[in-house]
Interface confidence: low
Amino acid sequence: YKAEVTVSQVYSGSLRVLNRHFSQDLGRRESIAFRSESAKAQKMLQELVASTRLGTYYNSSSVYSFGEGPLTCFFWFILDIPEYQRLTLSPEVVRELLVDELLSNSSTLASYKTEYEVDPEGLVILEASVNDIVVLNSTLGCYRYSYVNPGQVLPLKGPDQQTTSCLWHLQGPEDLMIKVRLEWTRVDCRDRVAMYDAAGPLEKRLITSVYGCSRQEPVMEVLASGSVMAVVWKKGMHSYYDPFLLSVKSVAFQDCQVNLTLEGRLDTQGFLRTPYYPSYYSPSTHCSWHLTVPSLDYGLALWFDAYALRRQKYNRLCTQGQWMIQNRRLCGFRTLQPYAERIPMVASDGVTINFTSQISLTGPGVQVYYSLYNQSDPCPGEFLCSVNGLCVPACDGIKDCPNGLDERNCVCRAMFQCQEDSTCISLPRVCDRQPDCLNGSDEEQCQEGVPCGTFTFQCEDRSCVKKPNPECDGQSDCRDGSDEQHCDCGLQGLSSRIVGGTVSSEGEWPWQASLQIRGRHICGGALIADRWVITAAHCFQEDSMASPKLWTVFLGKMRQNSRWPGEVSFKVSRLFLHPYHEEDSHDYDVALLQLDHPVVYSATVRPVCLPARSHFFEPGQHCWITGWGAQREGGPVSNTLQKVDVQLVPQDLCSEAYRYQVSPRMLCAGYRKGKKDACQGDSGGPLVCREPSGRWFLAGLVSWGLGCGRPNFFGVYTRVTRVINWIQQVLTGGGGSGGGGSHHHHHHGSHHHH
């Protein structure tokens, strides 16, 4: 005799009893009415299962909750199924067996026929697990049923000191969807919240779970697929306050079927977004957007933010949204990079874009901007990176495209190519009134507009000039004079310690900022406009440093231990972290501080010049870093502002030193032999380069490095030209405050060193 191997299969679900009605007592598990009714309903469920062929497998069951409307019973039951039948008894099959029994004319005296008028249509059976039952049982001491009426905002209070875990079973009218709002109120929190697209905590119906506070998402709203949701709130150790406000409402289903016709222009024309954006999209989301282009000269570009699409095998579900575009199946995924999906138009001038949630697990709502691009020249003067759909500078010595193709096939890399014989000359020699090419082609077209390219400067009227770095050089190169606008910057106030550095003189670096908390210098920064200071995002990594209210910014400061008449201080009214900043890779390590009042410029306080995106800082050039950081690795911060000259390093050289962890948003400076470098406390401070005009331009921000001043390891700086678009966007009020997906922070202090 061989014992048959069985497996415990757990099913969860609900049924409606048409001849019973919900009462408030039934909503409280501790009431006598609940205990009595749940025992009867459990017996009825047991009889129902037993009267089908599932009866022989029956193990146990429970009715754990009741809901509004005709009385809704929420239950689970366990069947011990022979191993070989495990796959044949899916929730759909089990439901069918139970519905058939409910509809049959059998003359049974069982309570599901005599006492309870069970609605077969309303029977819901879902797959569950033993673990789901364990989680459910752990919350039964604090189980709260709430019916959410339309128009009502229902606050949900956290577990009290006696209970560690609570479950809300939320239900609303059948034609509406449940929406939960979670708002962080504290920077320090250890509580967990999990939201399920079901009446109970079924792992397979998890919508999202949240642990720890997210500064990137101070408020999150989460949609269920329909009128039922379960929310489990588990209290963390030593958590004496609710770290967030939780509330819920019932909302109408929002349609996302759109037909649009685009105009024949190349700028952004609008956006598509999931219902209730920026709410998490619902597990039942199905959007269909049909876009028509004016002619086949154009392709359609979809611009995503912190979200990208990629091919996925057909047998794999998309876990963060499925996209169908021109019969191509793509999966969305969260990323801390920009991304564009380019849709070429070949035979038809229309395209349908479908977005579907394939699983219950969802994520922040998706917003995609759309524009047209010229199919014959998608990236005028630049390189189309087919990996991410972006236009990137070509042959500038920086691999912007993840596969590096923008730097392949270059005749002249980061140099000017003579038309006569393809020889290469360094960029500063172009339009310098000194012919270097064989026939002087480097000095031609210097007074007129040229096609835009990697190193051409774009004027405000969108025309381009050939002369490299024409900004603020005292000569008007643009027809509209825009290269000489906003030039109240970059001049040292008076004539003219960092590792290997020397002491600075007063007014020598009038843009230098000291960012302090409670009188202690934490990071450097640079003044870039009358209310704005730029610094490194990693200065704000620690949760205890995340609030702008904590910071004081000093300008015109020389010594840390004393004040002098030339220095001024400011509070910070707003803090903007780059939305793509990633602490582990140090990518996009830039932040902007808005000061509480405007700066009055003086000899000791004035801004540095910001470079254009096309500004070329030549490898080998000597530039300067300044700060109050440590003067040796592991040493204390300096009292007096230090300065040191460093050499800009070619990207490939630096990339090799750091085993290819150097992104296009990074720039390296220092020396192979080390000695001169930034160090702890210099983070966020300026790396500035002097142009021939005498003006100083911000090339980088102190970001990270291996140790300080070590041989073969350069200092790594945020490359300002690669984040300048975001800087301008924030300065002109275009937001950019750092959405960037659900992105939790655990950080390690200033000037990372490994």
């Epitope: 091919r311 691999k399 993840p402 596969n403 193709l405 392949r408 096939n409 290819y660 150097v662 296009p664």
Partner: antibody, heavy 124, light 111 residues
Amino acid sequence: EVQLVESGGGLVQPGRSLRLSCAASGFTFNDHVIYWVRQVPGKGLEWVSTISWNSDTIAYADSVKGRFTISRDNAKNALYLQMNSLRTEDTALYYCAREKDGDFYYDYFAMDVWGQGTTVTVSS
Amino acid sequence: QSALTQPPSASGSPGQSVTLSCTGTSSDVGYYNYVSWYLQHPGKAPKLMIYEVSKRPSGVPDRFSGSKSANTASLTVSGLQAEDEADYYCSSYAGSNKVVFGGGTKVTVLG
């Protein structure tokens, strides 16, 4: 199993043409740069041609430039080498090889999967 | 593009180390850190042993190590074993999407 299988080799007279094929399986073909490399019996390896995953970057060795054409059909997971104006010095075993997966910013220019090769003999 | 220079042969006894050299120019081996090494047994396809000068693909024993100095790359096989007897080829990226191979070194395991 990751595999590359070459075919189309044979005996051909100088000046004539031949088309080699390489069938890929077991990996996402259109994620990879692919190479043709040849080897004269008893001699060393010689790089012949490279094609990027979307065919927008193609390169040839000086010895075959203007005579050979590399192409790929990602829908069919296939790589081709059209060889025209064949010369006796083109006699060799022709391999197709896949470039090793690149890390985030760099290609490796290293071939981690090779076929078994197909023999081309150019003789009158 | 001219081939990289490799010595035609090298040998060593089991357990010993053998170092193979691969000399190029300042525009291939000297400029790029994209040197690879391949092993080829008679009648078989080449097998990648080292890429990016010194990185080993998974499955390659740590007896194989690579390095580079100026225009010369080296492959060291330590603790020589009978199955290491084979032809070894180096290759380097040479710019403009071109790859250049060495002429190969025949390694003999003595005894």
